[in-house]
Structures are given as C-alpha cells and as structure tokens.
Interface confidence: low
Amino acid sequence: DWVVAPISVPENGKGPFPQRLNQLKSNKDRDTKIFYSITGPGADSPPEGVFAVEKETGWLLLNKPLDREEIAKYELFGHAVSENGASVEDPMNISIIVTDQNDHKPKFTQDTFRGSVLEGVLPGTSVMQVTATDEDDAIYTYNGVVAYSIHSQEPKDPHDLMFTIHRSTGTISVISSGLDREKVPEYTLTIQATDMDGDGSTTTAVAVVEILDANDNAPMFEPQKYEAWVPENEVGHEVQRLTVTDLDVPNSPAWRATYHIVGGDDGDHFTITTHPETNQGVLTTKKGLDFEAQDQHTLYVEVTNEAPFAVKLPTATATVVVHVKDVNEAPVFVPPSKVVEVQEGIPTGEPVCVYTAEDPDKENQKISYRILRDPAGWLAMDPDSGQVTAVGTLDREDEQFVRNNIYEVMVLAMDNGSPPTTGTGTLLLTLIDVNDHGPVPEPRQITICNQSPVRQVLNITDKDLSPHTSPFQAQLTDDSDIYWTAEVNEEGDTVVLSLKKFLKQDTYDVHLSLSDHGNKEQLTVIRATVCDCHGHVETCPGPWKGGSGGGGSGAGVIAVIVVVVIAIVAGIVVLVISRKKRMAKYEKAEIKEMGEMHRELNA
C-alpha cells in the first residue's frame, strides 16, 4: 500500500550519510515506471535538503544529523509520478519523529537564589523554590527529568542538615529546629540539579538563605486617639494618618505595619493602607460619606506587622472619630433613568409625564427643572413641577431622532443652594405606534413587454409597526384597472402587477392604492414603461417592427382603416375633450391595438 508508518530517527546520528530510512513504494510500478519525490519543510523548503529520496528506487534518505531540540518532528509528503509526469498516487504523509538523546545538561534559572526564613521556625517550613530546566525530553524519556539535591551547607551550625530540598519541585524547607539569627544570620547552600531523574548530568548553583529576625515587638499607636473632619460624598479623601512605633528592625516585615479597621465601619466606607515610606496608616474614604445619614463615625483601627508575632503580644488599637462635614448636594432624579410610554403624534400641549428629583440635603431646597437635551425639540418641562409636555409632533418613524422606538431626552434639576448644584436625569420615551403611514410599493418604476408580459412583483413597505402593517390590500384606481391587474400575494407583503391588455410602446401611469391591516390607504403612481417585446425586458429595445403585410389589396385596406381610425380619433377627441388627459395614451394604444389586430388578420 502507498502508506508509510511514522519513522523514528535518533538525533545526533553518526551516519554514514546519506542514510537510508525507508522505501516509498507504489504498486502502480507494475504498469509503468514510477519516479518518486518528496516535498515539505526539510525536503524542498527550509531547512532544505535534510531529507531526499532516490528518484527511481523510492528510498528515503537522511542527509545529515538531526537535532530534536531544534525540530522534533518533520512532516513530509511523498509523491509518485509516471514517466510522462502524471501523478499515479495521492500525496502521502511521511512523519519523521526525532527521538531524544541526553545531549543537554540541566541549567539553573539563576546562578544564585535568595530566600529567607524566620529564626526559630518549625521543621517543615518552606523557605524558597529553585528551578532548573533541561532542554531534553522529559515526557517520553528521563533525559530531561531533573532531580534536585543539596550538595553542601555552610556553615554547618548547629549541624550540617538544617535544610532539605524536594527532589522534584525544588522547594527548600527547614528540616531541623535551631535556626538562630544571632548565631548564624545566613546559610549558603550548594544545590544540584541532575537529569535522568538523578542519574545523569549534574549542574550546580547557590542558594542563600537569610535568617530573619523574629517579630517580638508589636507596633504601638502614638497617639491612640484621633479626630478628623471629612466633607461628605468625597471618595478617596485622606481622612487621617495614624502613626505607630515599632522596636523591630526598621523596614523589615517585623517592623512594617499592617492596619485593619476592626470596628465602626459597618457600611464599609473606609479603607486603610500602609504608607510605604513612613509606615503610617493612611485612612481614606472608600465610599462617599453621607452627612444626612450619619454625621459621625467612630472607627477602631488595629495594627499588626507584615510578619506574624513570634511570641504572644498585645495588638494595639487606635480610635478615630470622623466628623462628616455637610456640603450642598446635587438633586437626584428618581429614577435616574425614567422610561415612559407615550403615543406618537399626541396633540401639542398634551402632558407626557412628571419627572422630578429629590435633594439629598436636609434643608428644604427649591428645585427647578429644564430640558438639557431634546434633539427634535418635541418637549417642554415646567420649571417648578417637572411636568413634561409635548410642544412638537412626536414621530416614532423619525429615524434621525428615534432609535428602536425610543426617544431619549436629558433633563436637568437645579437646587437653590449656595452654590447651586445640578443633577441630570434621562427620560426615555417609548413611542407607541399609531397607524400614520400607509403602505408603499417598491420599486415605483417598472418596464414590461406588451406581448406575453412578465408579472411585475413589487415589495410593499409600511413604516408602522404590526398590527398596522400586513396583510395589505391593493386596488387600481383612475381607470388603471382597464389595462392592469394588481394582486397581493398570499403572505400579504408583495403586490403583483400584470398587463392584461395590449398597450403600445410608451410610458404609462398606473394608479395603485395600497391599504394596510388598519385600513390606512396610500395612493402611489407607478411609472410603467411598456416595450414592444415578448416576455421579460430590462429596457426597451429599438422601434418595434410589425409582421410584413400581405399583397396590395391588403395595403389598400390598411390605408382605408388608417383614414377611418384618424376620423374616429378626431371624433373621440371632440366628444371626450373634458376627459382626463392621462387616458389619451390608453386611447391611442387601443387604436393601435385595432391596427395590430387588422395586420394580424391580413397576414
């Protein structure tokens, strides 16, 4: 079969090259001489020439040693063609998998790692993690599987096995008790990473373990009581800086303060952070305070250190009394965004809704209203009551101002505080549809043949919403029904216009009346270009030539008929002079129709 199983080739092969790997063979070689070729990265595209194929025998050749860490798999295609160059087989996938050799040593990510641990910690305490990588394969072989070990520890006090390293993860932990910073402030560990899961090549690095001072002094507030004044509503306002002293090593985790609000902040209004330089607790507002709801907050703040206490110590607590200062607050519309349903086209002066705001301040401030943004200029707002009325015609179908049936208005409320403040609200008028648009056909110009004419399908559109739309009804007016028929389809959303009588080539007005489900009627004039042609037409062809007449007698008869027709036409013009001019074409067409009929008889 024209199939090759995946081929495994070890990296770093010694040759000799070219080295035969596998033979491509097509069973079509019984019928014709076959020539073999390969394509793909490693053959005819970069890295070119790694692989080749003996053209006539099909032997797949390796031209040089492979490097798995560079390319771990090659995907080639084998081709077989006959002597005349015609392909005799579909291209065949050839997968060449480069198998790993342990040709890389592990490498630590750093030459020196640094970690720290508190003095006096219990065995099992994690100190740090070191990492080594190996480019070799660690999935299918152990070539890249790294095992960690500690080669040596300096100094060896109180003994030489103070630390251990997890052979797989590289996590260094305390294994013995007795870490004493005063005796040994720092240990240097020589660490090893060995591939083959501990049986292969080894590399070394250094891990420095700093022994930290234990946190045996608690931070203390100085002073313990604070008083602060904060304007209401301000977020991120610095309320107070709380100062602590700590006898532990400055700028160490045992000295750096961590502050917590432990009481008095049920509303979660405050937050406290540690200033990175001064170590002070910076108390700020997380939410705006509300003078009207609570004019004073008594907070209890506790301070600890970044590092846990090494011995049992009392945790200091400070009291912060926060006085809230009153400020004039902006009126707030209730709700901030109000949705009101209103019928389009309501009379001018008709009330739409009342939209009012509330003032958060305790004083009974007067609120006045005005419209801030009314794109179409349809509304007015009473400054005292907040009553919104229509001053223009609300039109749901106005695409410039109305989106998805919604007309958006922004209103403003202003109090009479000192200084005055303003608040805005959004009024979303959902315009309820009324049947104020009749249906219209599209297109309004048609071209049609006067012989075997194709029915013209016109789409019907109505700007209104259901139920003021389909099903539609169609009717021809102003005598258009003499020559035309109009029929609405079963779905009720298109109208079919047909020519039912012969008309001569010319342009005609078809008066089409369409009405919707709510009986809203719309008259549209369709401009119909009638052409001298059969069946379908886009534009009229050149002047229409009738069938050739018979002999001379025929020609004479025609001449008589023409004279008679002219006389009749003159008579009709006199008789129906008052009749609408637009019918004139249809009269002429009728006369022509008589002529055509005679011509056909003559023929």
């Epitope: 917590h260 432990v262 049920d266 008594t298 907070l299 049992k312 945790t315 607590t317």
Partner: antibody
C-alpha cells in the same frame, strides 16, 4: 469565667421583638469580644454577630437589618435585640466569648459559652 | 459567605477506636501573611453548650485531652479522636473565622456502638 444569659419571656409572638441580656463575670468586656450564636431545635449553630472591645460590631448580613448588639462595660452586660421575629427564629440563643481581642489570639474562636436561653416564636 | 461542609453527618464507633471527621470550606482559610488557618472545632454534648476544642485548625485549647487532634490546611480539615471514649458522644462542629460572617459546618454526630 462565666457567661449567663438573662432573658425576657421565652415565648415571643410573631412580628414582635426579642431582647436578651448576657451578664459576664471573671473578665472585662474591654478585653474580650462577645459573640451571639443561635441553634434552632435539632439543627446546627448559626453565628449572629459580635461586639468588639471598643463597641464596634459585625453582624450576619442576612440579619443585619433587624439585629442590634450593644453593651454596658461598667455592668459587664451585653445586649441582643432582634426585631420582627418569625417562627423560623425559634432557637436557643447563646452568648460566647472570643479567645481574645487580637487576631493573634484566634479571636474568631469562642472559648466560653453561656448556657443559652430558649426562644419560641409562636402566636 | 464561606460555606463549611462536614462529613459524614453521623458515625458510630466502638470505644477505643480511632475516628476522623472531615470539614471542607468553599475557599482557602489559610492567610498568607501569618500562615495560619482560621478554623476552629467545637464539641457539643447532648443538652450542653458547645465547647472549644481546637483553634488555628490544629492548636488544642488548654484542658482539651490530647486524643483530639486537628489537622489540614487551605480548604480541607480533619478532626481526629485517636481513641474514642464513651464521654466523647457529641456533635462536632467546625467553624471558620477567616471572613464575616463566621460560619459553622452542619456538624458530625458521633455515636458510640
């Protein structure tokens, strides 16, 4: 160390309020926070709230709107007041002391508990 | 809020047997700054108030017999009674105090065969 709940009537009508007093001895309320915990009949424990040494409080969010914990340090008394009681508030109510005032003490753990007072909500 | 789940809900053992009960939290109770697990274990004997056995997940409260041992970290915790006595008949509750509101597990009822 002792905590004794002194309660009003054991029976409370629905929509009425409940008041319980916890009187402590052997330690100061300025040094130890006091928790309130309840246990419906045949069910598990439910933490209601805590009052810290400085008088600050934390409540279970579901009960916050109708629960008030206060204290009188000089009388060594802690008070629980709960409004708008319903039948599912029927339980044994305990006051319990935190191990200490500081995080280091494991102050969320409660080392001394009162004997509890039974409250039945029924019309 | 943090949800505490205890299992089994009840178990029956003979005097002298070793018993373990589990408590799982919906999030880690280990605080990285101090490497402490904010978990306590209580014992409630029939008709009595709860009694604190263990805090910080593994620290035995003074006066608690050393047959009671707490272990675990993060989200999985265990209370072990190395050799059950008849007086250990009770419901055992775990409780987290990592975040508000403090929450208890549903309890494990220990019965003596």
């Amino acid at each position: 160390v002792q905590l004794v709940e002194e309660s009003g009537p054991g029976l409370v009508a629905p929509s009425q309020s409940l008041s319980i007093t916890c009187t402590v001895s052997g330690f100061s309320l300025t040094s130890y926070p006091i928790n309130w915990v309840r246990q419906p009949p045949g069910k598990g424990l439910e933490w209601l709230g805590v009052i810290w040494t400085g008088g600050g409080t934390n409540y279970d969010s579901a009960l916050k709107s109708r629960l008030t914990i206060s204290k009188d340090n000089s009388k060594s008394q802690v008070f629980l007041k709960m409004n708008s009681l319903q039948t599912d508030d029927t339980a044994r109510y305990y006051c319990a002391r935190s191990r200490g005032a500081y995080d280091f003490d494991g102050r969320g753990a409660m080392d001394y508990w009162g004997q509890g007072t039974t409250v039945t909500v029924s019309s | 809020e943090l949800v505490m789940t205890q299992s089994p809900s009840s178990l029956a053992v003979s005097v002298g047997e070793k018993v373990t009960m589990s408590c799982k939290s919906s999030q880690s109770l280990l605080y990285s700054s101090n490497q402490k697990n904010y978990l306590a274990w209580y014992q409630q004997k029939p008709g009595q108030s709860p009694k604190l056995l263990i805090y910080w997940a593994s620290t035995r409260e003074s006066g608690v017999p050393d047959r009671f041992t707490g272990s675990g970290s993060g989200t999985d915790f265990t209370l072990t009674i190395s050799s059950v006595k008849a007086e250990d008949l009770a419901v055992y509750y775990c409780q987290q105090y990592y975040s508000y509101p403090y929450t208890f597990g549903g309890g494990t009822k220990l019965e003596i065969k």
